[in-house]
Interface confidence: low
């Protein structure tokens, strides 16, 4: 058994666990009773005889049931992510590059290409990458926007990622995407360059499918004023990775206590 | 200063704050070293004069930023969740009422109307719905789809909600989708008939935007022995909330131990 | 993690979650909640070592962080991690009634 | 909530979250840490009263399950609720480096 | 169109509780931080407190007893209550956006209300 | 809390001036450093933050260096409707903010 060296401050003693399932057990108790705001257990005098209600039941069961699309609990932490993770910044390829070229064109869309051999060089393998977040900085929007972003796939095809509503704004705003599982797959295959694309959202019968908003990096012919912040605050790969010395370390004490 | 009942069990003391703060800074000062797997602070010998480059510090505030669209830490439970949650259902008005004529032909999307009389007997006031969840019950689909959700805005126009990606399945499963916020919009207006859509995501520049998922209670001229699902397990609202009267009572003990 | 997986299949003796049972009838004296009969509630138990003081050895004690003291608590303590719901079926006078009560089972625990 | 709000604008004698600011230089006597000068650590402190017993009346102890003991533990404890990260800079060797501290700032605390 | 207008400012006597309201409108409330600032006549700017998106706040030191500050998302209202109002307290009370782009700069003040001119007086 | 110095409290300038205010505070706060013109009536308007970055739309005659603990506001050719009070304000990572207690800007 456990003592601290601070009397003062230690709260583990030799435990009697049947008193703690007592207790427990009388807590749960309270508990229930305090959930449902009763003073005492309810009369049982009125209740019908016989099995509940078909309906009664159906409900309980929908009650019970982990549907698709229903947020389960938040997972506990892994133990991996209770170190610190490095931070690095992956920016995007100018849109000189002629990656862009075949893709200049749409009123709909703008392109985000990424050069992965950078990307590996901040992380070098899939499995050290926690977390990775497209930023984009917003500039002002005048009415609301709702825009889709999509992950280059194969040839011409995008598949599609999330979406969001955007409020107008007189002022810019950084914008952050998770794309965690995005850029773990570019780590894991051989692409020289990857890319996303943010789309206006089109519904089936909506015409008026242009994008209205303004990402900083792709605003041309602007008041002059603005070119200071495009290079520096072009949309941006924020990673955040074990680095890798750390999880070698990690991965030989795979012990448990 | 609190005394326990129980000594056995109570971890409670007269706790000296000075000395509480002292242990919380020496365990900070493990936990940080812990977490960089450091065994001793970094030497700072060949540390380089002056500030710290720009782009480092750009970079630890693009970490410390908090944006658009990334997830904040969760709410703390606030305290009328504590409580118990009273649960009900209303099912979608039935496809042949007259509502539903004027949405019949669409490829793309389905429709579903609720009553909000029925609404209202089951939450009287918007302020104690605590979740509205959609449940559909989707039957066997061949192909992966993404769907989107709307819901009914004004006259014609439809408000996106949500979207899903769903998987290719053999059997009918359930889907679920929060609409909480909706309904508590509903429960505050006059309206008498409430609807959603469900339809296809159309992509700005795709053309295949049907509606492959069949959704019970929406599929006709089928084998019969679907019939009887049917009328049970059409699309309904499953909703929580607080009982009128506990509601009350917790309003009149607003205050703070 | 210290959740029913690792806890119920160990005899770890520091923090962990335990096994309970909890039957309405047996337990509690109850017979008014209709469904469900009883509930695995479980709870948390276990000493969250002190792992820091300044004589310590730095190495020995860093790799202890993680389970004992994650939070850097001055006085670590083991709490419910993960906690689900539970639906009850009861009746107030003739009417049925289903309600969810928050956080009743607890899946994993944690040195907070 | 027993978050900074309540809880340094109060006197609550019972669990809550206490203002701790650490500053890297003078609390831990470190010059590695770059980035920030400190932060506001806080800290989680305070009884959370077992309220129930069998010859305690009902209706007395229920209000209080709330706050004093809502996951119904056996001995509950005062613990951090809401937690949120710190990004660092440090150098190692001459390369500076940013990195993210998990769980490192207490926003709130609660009786678990 | 970004917009904070503070209200509820007037005369009041020493001693007594005052609570301003600023109604914002135009952008995302619930999502930007809030600054409560004032300035006594013909002097500087003095910062009272902040608020957090999720209700956390910071004051001055020299407005911990007496300055509360808390929102209300669902009205877009941030509120400052004072209480035990002393002479020295007459200004013109600002409600300001905290600045966004890098999330530290939350103190730096992007967008302000008109003001609200309280006067402490008997 | 961090104690702002500005100086000087007021000053005399002419159109197309270039001008200069420093602001110095009680302890070094790396660059977490703000600017603000108030002009009578109206509430302040932010010019810089980070000691050197121009707000949005605000005119490139303004420009704002230092870290540490001294830092400077410069306009560097004076315009008519310039003339104001400037302030500058900490927000370093301790437990408060601190304006500076202004400079006036006005005609020579």
């Known amino acids: 058994d456990y003592k601290d060296d601070d009397d003062k401050l230690s709260t583990s003693k030799t435990i009697d666990m049947e008193l703690v399932k007592r207790k427990r057990i009388e807590a749960i108790r309270g508990q229930i009773l305090s959930k449902l705001r009763l003073a005492s257990p309810p009369s049982q005098g009125e209740v019908p005889p016989g099995p509940l209600p078909e309906a009664v039941l159906a409900l309980y069961n929908s009650t019970r049931d982990r549907v698709a699309g229903e947020s389960a609990e938040p997972e506990p932490e892994p133990e991996a992510d209770y170190y610190a993770k490095e931070v690095t910044r992956v920016l995007m390829v100018e849109t000189h590059n002629e990656i862009y070229d075949k893709f200049k064109q749409s009123t709909h869309s703008i392109y985000m290409f990424f050069n992965t051999s950078e990307l590996r060089e901040a992380v070098p393998e899939p499995v050290l990458l926690s977390r990775a977040e497209l930023r984009l900085l917003r500039l002002k929007l005048k009415v609301e926007q709702h825009v889709e972003l999509y992950q280059k796939y194969s040839n011409n095809s995008w598949r599609y990622l999330s979406n969001r509503l955007l409020a107008p704004s007189d002022s810019p705003e950084w914008l952050s995407f998770d794309v965690t599982g995005v850029v773990r797959q570019w780590l894991s295959r051989g692409g020289e360059i990857e890319g996303f694309r943010l789309s206006a959202h089109c519904s089936c019968d909506s015409r008026d499918n242009t994008l209205q908003v303004d990402i900083n990096g792709f605003t041309t012919g602007r008041r002059g004023d603005l070119a200071t912040i495009h290079g520096m605050n072009r949309p941006f790969l924020l990673l955040m990775a074990t680095p890798l010395e750390r999880a070698q370390h990690l991965q030989s004490s795979r012990h448990r206590r | 200063d609190y005394k326990d009942d129980d000594d056995k069990l109570s971890t409670s003391k007269t706790i000296d704050m000075e000395l509480v703060k002292r242990k919380r800074i020496e365990a900070i000062r493990g936990q940080i070293l812990s977490k960089l797997r450091l065994a001793s602070p970094p030497s700072q010998g060949e540390v380089p004069p002056g500030p710290l480059p720009e782009a480092v510090l750009a970079l630890y505030n693009s970490t410390r930023d908090r944006v658009a669209g990334e997830s904040a830490e969760p709410e703390p439970e606030p305290e009328a969740d504590y409580y118990a949650k009273e649960v009900t259902r209303v099912l979608m008005v039935e496809t042949h009422n007259e509502i539903y004529d004027k949405f019949k032909q669409s490829t793309h999307s389905i429709y579903m109307f609720f009553n909000t009389s029925e609404l209202r007997e089951a939450v009287p006031e918007p302020v104690l719905l605590s979740r509205a969840e959609l449940r559909l019950l989707r039957l066997k689909l061949k192909v992966e789809q993404h769907v989107e959700l709307y819901q009914k805005y004004s006259n014609n126009s439809w408000r996106y909600l949500s979207n899903r990606l769903l998987a290719p399945s053999d059997s009918p499963e359930w889907l679920s989708f929060d609409v909480t916020g909706v309904v508590r919009q509903w429960l505050s207006r006059g309206g008498e008939i409430e609807g959603f859509r469900l339809s296809a995501h159309c992509s700005c520049d795709s053309r295949d935007n049907t509606l492959q998922v069949d959704i019970n209670g929406f599929t006709t001229g089928r084998r019969g022995d679907l019939a009887t699902i049917h009328g049970m397990n059409r699309p309904f609202l499953l909703l929580m909330a607080t009982p009128l009267e506990r509601a009350q009572h917790l309003q009149s003990s607003r205050h703070r131990r | 993690a210290l959740d029913t997986n690792y806890c119920f299949s160990s005899t770890e003796k520091n923090c962990c979650v335990r096994q309970l049972y909890i039957d309405f009838r047996k337990d509690l004296g109850w017979k008014w909640i209709h469904e469900p009969k009883g509930y695995h509630a479980n709870f948390c138990l276990g000493p969250c070592p002190y792992i820091w003081s300044l004589d310590t050895q730095y190495s020995k004690v860093l790799a202890l962080y993680n389970q004992h003291n994650p939070g850097a608590s001055a006085a670590p303590c083991c709490v419910p991690q993960a906690l689900e719901p539970l639906p009850i079926v009861y009746y107030v006078g003739r009417k049925p009634k289903v309600e969810q009560l928050s956080n009743m089972i607890v899946r994993s625990c944690k040195c907070s | 909530a027993l978050d900074t709000n309540y809880c340094f604008s109060s006197t609550e004698k019972n669990c809550c979250v206490r203002q701790l600011y650490i500053d890297f230089r003078k609390d831990l006597g470190w010059k590695w840490i770059h980035e920030p000068k400190g932060y506001h650590a806080n800290f989680c402190l305070g009884p959370c009263p077992y309220i129930w017993s069998l010859d305690t009346q009902y209706s007395k102890v229920l209000a209080l399950y709330n706050q004093h003991n809502p996951g119904a533990s056996a001995a509950p404890c005062c613990v951090p609720q809401a937690l949120e990260p710190l990004p660092i800079v440090y150098y190692v060797g001459r390369k500076p480096k940013v990195e993210q501290l998990s769980n490192m700032i207490v926003r709130s605390c609660k009786c678990s | 169109q970004v917009q904070l207008v503070e209200s509820g400012g007037g005369v009041v006597q020493p001693g007594r509780s005052l609570r301003l309201s600023c109604a914002a409108s135009?952008?995302?409330?619930?999502?930007?931080?809030m600054n409560w600032i004032r300035q006594p006549p013909g002097k500087g700017l003095e910062w009272i407190g902040y608020i957090y998106t999720s209700g956390t706040t910071y004051r001055a030191n020299w407005a911990r007893g007496r300055f509360t500050i808390s929102r209300d998302n669902s009205k877009n209202t941030l509120y400052l209550q004072m209480n035990s109002l002393r002479a020295e307290d007459t200004a013109v009370y600002y409600c300001?956006?905290?600045?966004?782009?890098?999330?530290?700069?939350?103190?730096?003040?992007?967008?302000w209300g008109q003001g609200t001119l309280v006067t402490v007086s008997s | 809390d961090i104690q702002m110095t500005q100086s000087p409290s007021s000053l005399s300038a002419s159109v197309g001036d270039r001008v200069t205010i420093t602001c110095q505070a009680s302890q070094s706060i790396s660059t977490y450093l703000a600017w603000y013109q108030q002009k009578p009536g109206q509430p302040p308007k932010l010019l810089i933050y980070a000691a050197s970055t121009l707000e949005w739309g605000v005119p490139s005659r303004f420009s704002g260096s230092g870290s540490g603990t001294d830092f400077t506001l410069t306009i560097s050719s004076l315009q008519p409707e310039d003339f104001a009070t400037y302030y500058c304000?900490?927000?370093?990572?301790?437990?408060?903010?601190?304006f500076g207690q202004g400079t006036k800007v006005e005609i020579k």
């Open positions: 135009g952008f995302h409330f619930s999502s930007e931080a």
């Open positions: 300001a956006r905290g600045w966004h782009i890098f999330g530290h700069h939350y103190w730096v003040m992007h967008f």
């Open positions: 304000q900490s927000y370093s990572d301790g437990d408060s903010v601190g």
